[in-house]
């Protein structure tokens, strides 16, 4: 009878995690008589994964009734498969003895395990940033294999260029993480934009995956400031409004300055919102100008999200022809933003 | 259903021959080791012969020079050719099959009696 | 030759003990152990072998273990079937050995 031989037929398999890995063993003789065993990776340190004599091996299961010594299969179905498992399983086969001796190998099977990437997660900027600037934004994948793996960037559906990728480790390992940083050059209508980092792997058959930062929480658009005066009913009395426009976030207070010596200081709360994610609100003053013989620089200071403050000042003239200057149709005054100088 | 039936036994004076047959019946019989155990009366069991799968044969020392073992897969039988029989040769004999990958005994045959006297 | 010892040679207990059968062996035999009961006039029937692995078909309140040269057979709970003789046998090594066998009787 020719000598046995230990077939495995398979020189790789790929399996889904958490799914069930089948390796086929078979072999050609009965004889001699003694255990057939299982082993990832080969040499000294080569890992027992099933021992037909003897052991509890919870996640291996015989595909065969192979505890009859008719069997010559001897094919094991491992449960529960991870990217831990993955490696090049041999079955060999031993010859009964004190101790049982090798008598001969199969020529391995190689287990790859396909992991899911995990789901990107996008981080930007720790500080917000202005328009014209650039700023970085990162994505992150982890856990999945085989290493190959795409990654692409997006800004509002359209595919960004500028970005560096890397997938590591570089060499063999079980499982694999991506990183990738791509640079993106804000504007003053991002507030509502959104950066998207897209991952597609074999694993996710063709639905990649997506993480998306909002712009809205990286971009801090500086507000416009127009100061404007208009006369209102009332004799002697001007109404000094401060225009703060498109500014994001929301964060903002707001200063006024009599002459430099602060005259009255609001925080923005009744706000309106622009299509493009912005902010404006408007501040006014009273002032009467009869209670003063010289002309009163008013400045308009604001502080928005504790940036160095920005102002504008308008010279409000108090020596010629305040009637005249009153005799203009007044705008409508709320009362909230109120201020009279005496 | 996996069965054997050992046949041959009988009263025999001592010095001479007997044959013994296990016809089996379920199994691939040339896939299996097949063995002899006997056991004398009230007493315990002991190991006869055995007979791989590819015809090796072996025996104990009490027995070796005067017991051959023989298979015809063909016929799914088994042999135990038994000469120069002594008084201590009696006993029940069993034929069994070793049926585990390790050739653990795990089907045996009902018995046959074999007498050595004169 | 490699001599299988068993104790004790006869135990007496009742329906319902948990029972445990000894088995030694002169040298180490890798486990390769079996466990066989016989009841009068029939033939042996396979229980356990490789010293743990449970034959088809035989109930789990039999179970074997022990490794290198000192092996055990426990019968969880006994019952009136269960009355018989008890062998092991070496099967590492030709020639194959049996214990002298250990007589379970009822109390």
């Known amino acids: 009878e020719e000598e046995l031989q230990v077939i495995q037929p398979d020189k790789s398999v790929s399996v889904a995690a958490g799914e069930s890995a089948i390796l086929h063993c078979t072999v050609t003789s009965l004889i001699p008589v003694g255990p057939i065993q299982w082993f990832r990776g080969a040499g000294p340190a080569r890992e027992l994964i099933y021992n037909q004599k003897e052991g509890h091996f919870p996640r291996v299961t015989t595909v065969s009734e192979s505890t009859k010594r008719e069997n010559m299969d001897f094919s094991i179905s491992i449960s529960n498969i991870t990217p831990a498992d993955a490696g090049t399983y041999y079955c060999v086969k031993f010859r009964k003895g004190s101790p049982d001796t090798e008598f001969k190998s199969g020529a391995g099977t190689e287990l790859s395990v396909r992991a899911k990437p995990s789901a990107p997660v996008v981080s930007g900027p720790a500080a917000r940033a202005t328009p014209q600037h650039t700023v970085s934004f990162t994505c992150e994948s982890h856990g999945f294999s085989p290493r190959d793996i795409t990654l692409k960037w997006f800004k509002n559906g359209n595919e960004l260029s500028d970005f560096q990728t890397n997938v590591d480790p570089v060499g063999e390992s079980v499982s694999y993480s991506i990183h990738s940083t791509a640079k993106v050059v804000l504007t003053r209508e991002d507030v509502h934009s959104q950066v998207i980092c897209e991952v597609a792997h074999v694993t996710l058959q063709g639905d990649p995956l997506r993480g998306t930062a909002n712009l809205s929480e990286t971009i801090r658009v500086p507000p416009t400031l127009e100061v404007t005066q208009q006369p209102v009913r009332a004799e002697n009395q001007v109404n000094v409004t401060c225009q703060v426009r498109k500014f994001y976030p929301q964060r903002l207070q707001l200063t006024w300055l009599e002459n430099g010596n602060v005259s009255r200081t609001e925080t923005a709360s009744t706000v309106t919102e622009n299509k493009d994610g912005t902010y404006n609100w408007m501040s006014w003053l009273l002032v009467n100008v009869s209670a003063h013989r010289d002309d009163v620089k008013l400045t308009c200071q604001v502080e928005h999200d504790g940036q160095p403050a920005v102002s504008k000042s308008h010279d409000l003239k108090v020596s010629a022809h305040p009637k005249e200057q009153g005799s203009n149709t007044a705008a409508e005054n709320t009362g909230s933003n109120e201020r009279n100088i005496y | 259903e996996v069965q054997l039936v050992e046949s041959g036994g009988g009263l025999v004076q001592p010095g001479g021959s007997l044959r013994l047959s296990c016809a089996a019946s379920?199994?691939?019989?040339?896939?299996?080791?097949m063995h002899w155990v006997r056991q004398p009366t009230g007493k315990g069991l002991e190991w006869v012969s055995t007979?791989?799968?590819?015809?090796?044969?072996y025996f104990p020392g009490s027995v070796k020079g005067r017991f051959t073992i023989s298979r015809e897969n063909a016929k799914n039988s088994l042999y135990l050719q038994m000469n120069s029989l002594r008084a201590g040769d009696t006993a029940v004999y069993y034929c069994?099959?070793?049926?585990?990958?390790?050739?653990?005994?795990?089907?045996w045959g009902q018995g046959t009696m074999v007498t050595v006297s004169s | 030759d490699i001599q299988m010892t068993q104790s004790p040679s006869s135990l007496s207990a009742s329906v319902g003990d948990r029972v445990t059968i000894t088995c030694r062996a002169s040298q180490d035999i890798n486990n390769y152990l079996a466990w066989f009961q016989q009841k009068p006039g029939k033939a042996p029937k396979s229980l356990i072998y490789t010293a743990s692995s449970l034959q088809s078909g035989v109930p789990s309140k039999f179970s074997g273990s022990g490794s290198g040269t000192d092996f055990t057979l426990t019968i969880s709970s006994l019952q009136p079937e269960d009355f018989a003789t008890y062998y092991c046998q070496q099967y590492n090594t030709y020639p194959y050995t049996f214990g002298q066998g250990t007589k379970l009787e009822i109390k």
């Open positions: 007979i791989g799968i590819a015809g090796d044969t």
């Open positions: 379920g199994f691939t019989f040339s896939s299996f080791d």
């Open positions: 069994a099959r070793g049926g585990n990958w390790d050739d653990a005994l795990d089907i």
